[in-house]
Interface confidence: low
């Protein structure tokens, strides 16, 4: 094995709680480890996990490449939360999941030139700044190095939501400054999304993996996948989708590497479903397509979509108002 840019003390060193270091102007020593953390220089990893930390440790070692700050008590991530002197230039993967983060400020991840993977999952984000990932409020920001952005279950409880669209807040952060043009994986599962703003995917052209599972998406009618020529997996399981229309089907079929996951949606098997059933029978892009079943109408419940034919898919005639019953 080759030598590494830092020396190879391979065991995790754990710093004792009583060694909490004060913030000083001195840069941290390469071999020091923040209080309540475990550090391995050989693996370039620092883990400060389930330690009730209220803020990001000041004295992170400069070699850190993988930083785990999960399961702590942080509520706000301020601008420059990871700005250090010298900078944490090697930090590549940052996991902040399972904290109590309510606010991520503009520029929270500035001065991390190598940050490729960021996980903010399981934080009740009531205020995600539009410039959390872009770093500045310019119309076109410096490109973010992020390749993976994991934002599963970041929706706050209903009573804590601001008077604005949660979807809109998240999308604003994804699109600000066109900084995330290089993003390849985006996970937005379990966020109660009712809709997907139509412009979001067009501005993330490098996406390979998009996870929108376990949301409340009812329709994809206004969502365009046309630009996502690199998309390899699209997770739409456990939503509220009723049918996919022709335009969407054609766009998905046109993506060269795509695999689509559609399990556990309440498919409505009426006359509007005919095109989708025809497409399902012919396509290879849908994984587990034999598992897709009807939820409505009642007479069709649990029927397998692939086994339906046009005669099964009828719509009740619309009665004139004078004949409708209440």
């Amino acid at each position: 094995s080759s030598s590494s840019p830092t020396s190879s003390a391979s065991s995790f060193s754990s710093s004792a709680p009583f060694l909490a270091s004060a913030v000083s102007a001195q840069p941290p020593l390469p071999d020091q480890c923040p209080a309540l953390c475990e550090c391995s220089e050989a693996a370039r990893t620092v883990k400060c996990v389930n330690r009730n930390l209220l803020e990001v440790p000041a004295d992170l070692p400069p070699y850190v490449r993988n930083l785990f700050l999960t399961g702590n008590q942080m509520t706000v991530l301020p601008a420059g939360a990871f700005a250090r002197q010298p900078p944490l230039a090697d930090l590549e993967a940052l996991n902040l999941s399972g904290n109590h983060l309510k606010e991520v400020c503009a520029g929270a991840f500035e001065h991390l030139p190598g940050l490729r993977r960021l996980d903010l999952s399981h934080n009740p984000l009531t205020n995600l700044s539009a410039f959390a990932f872009a770093g500045s409020n310019a119309s076109v920001s410096a490109p973010s190095p992020l390749v993976e952005l994991i934002l599963n279950h970041i929706v706050p409880p209903e009573d804590e939501r601001q008077n604005r669209s949660f979807e809109g807040m998240v999308v604003a952060a994804l699109l600000a400054g066109r900084a995330l043009q290089g993003l390849r994986r985006l996970e937005l599962a379990s966020n109660h999304f009712l809709y997907l703003p139509r412009d979001v995917l067009a501005q993330l052209p490098s996406l390979r993996h998009l996870d929108l599972s376990n949301n409340s998406l009812v329709s994809l009618t206004y969502v365009s996948f046309r630009n996502l020529t690199h998309l390899e997996s699209l997770h739409l399981e456990d939503n509220a989708l009723k049918v996919l229309h022709n335009g969407t089907l054609a766009e998905l079929q046109g993506l060269p590497h795509i695999r689509v996951f559609l399990d556990n949606n309440p498919w409505v098997c009426d006359c509007h479903m005919a095109d989708m059933v025809t497409w399902l029978k012919e396509t290879e892009v849908v994984q587990g397509k034999d598992r897709l079943t009807c939820a409505y109408p009642e007479k069709m419940r649990n029927r397998v979509l692939l086994e339906l034919n046009s005669a099964d898919l009828d719509c009740d005639p619309i009665l004139p108002p004078s004949l409708q019953t209440s």
Epitope: S4, A42, A93, R184, H209
Partner: antibody
Framework: QVQLQQSRPELVKPGASVKMSCKAS????????ISWVKQRTGQGLEWIGE????????YYNEKFKGRATLTADKSSSTAYMQLSSLTSEDSAVYFC??????????WGQGTTLTVSS | QIVLTQSPAIMSASLGERVTLTCTAS???????LHWYQQKPGSSPKLWIY???NLASGVPARFSGSGSGTSYSLTISSMEAEDAATYYC?????????FGAGTKLELK
């Protein structure tokens, strides 16, 4: 210390498939990217793809997409690469390497693949 | 993709001589993500210089690296016998990741 131990040399026939392994030790397997790199005799280095076992993210060089399949087994801290539809052009040494933006710090010793009838 | 062109392909140097190897990228590369590896016959490559100018641990101080944009170089201030090897530049800036074809440095 960090080590990447690769599987033994392979001699296979054209058209066949091969699966080679890279067992990691000395660090937390799910925390780091493993890349695979090809080197033909007397030639340079060619990146095949990378796998991030933590999230099972996989990125391929388009040139190898469809013929190379990268997987990882977290329980044994082992990364695998399968190559299919082999031809003589695939005869090479294949390295696994750990690292990312800031270089591949650790390399396996290489697995020599010979494709011959 | 970003093509890295190394020159010269083969170079001979005498003991004590100053040696410069160059690596030119077909489009601009962030200097944080431009690295050099040393490889000797029968061995795996070793990370030698990372992020343009940082020496990997154990690399002698006679080595240095510099550059930005599309032009990068590795310099040995005073050639020693153990420096004879092939050196590859490598970019981790854009997918697919690419390597230069290598410069084989021989002892004259």
């Amino acid at each position: 210390q960090v080590q990447l131990q690769q599987s033994r040399p392979e001699l296979v026939k054209p058209g066949a498939s091969v699966k080679m392994s890279c067992k990691a030790s000395g660090y937390t397997f799910t925390d780091y990217v493993i890349s695979w790199v090809k080197q033909r005799t007397g030639q340079g280095l060619e990146w095949i793809g990378e796998i991030y076992p933590g999230s099972n993210s996989i990125y391929y060089n388009e040139k190898f997409k469809g013929r190379a399949t990268l997987t990882a087994d977290k329980s044994s801290s082992t990364a695998y690469m399968q190559l299919s539809s082999l031809t003589s052009e695939d005869s090479a040494v294949y390295f696994c390497a750990m690292g990312g933006n800031y270089g591949f710090d650790y390399w396996g010793q290489g697995t020599t693949l010979t494709v011959s009838s | 993709q970003i093509v890295l062109t190394q020159s010269p392909a083969i170079m001979s140097a005498s003991l004590g001589e100053r040696v410069t190897l160059t690596c030119t990228a077909s489009s601009s590369v962030n200097s944080n993500y431009l690295h050099w590896y040393q490889q000797k016959p029968g061995s795996s490559p070793k990370l030698w210089i990372y992020s343009t100018s940082n020496l990997a641990s154990g690399v002698p101080a006679r080595f240095s690296g510099s550059g930005s944009g599309t032009s990068y170089s590795l310099t040995i201030s005073s050639m020693e016998a153990e420096d004879a090897a092939t050196y590859y530049c490598h970019q981790y800036h854009r997918s697919p990741l690419t390597f230069g074809a290598g410069t084989k440095l021989e002892l004259k």
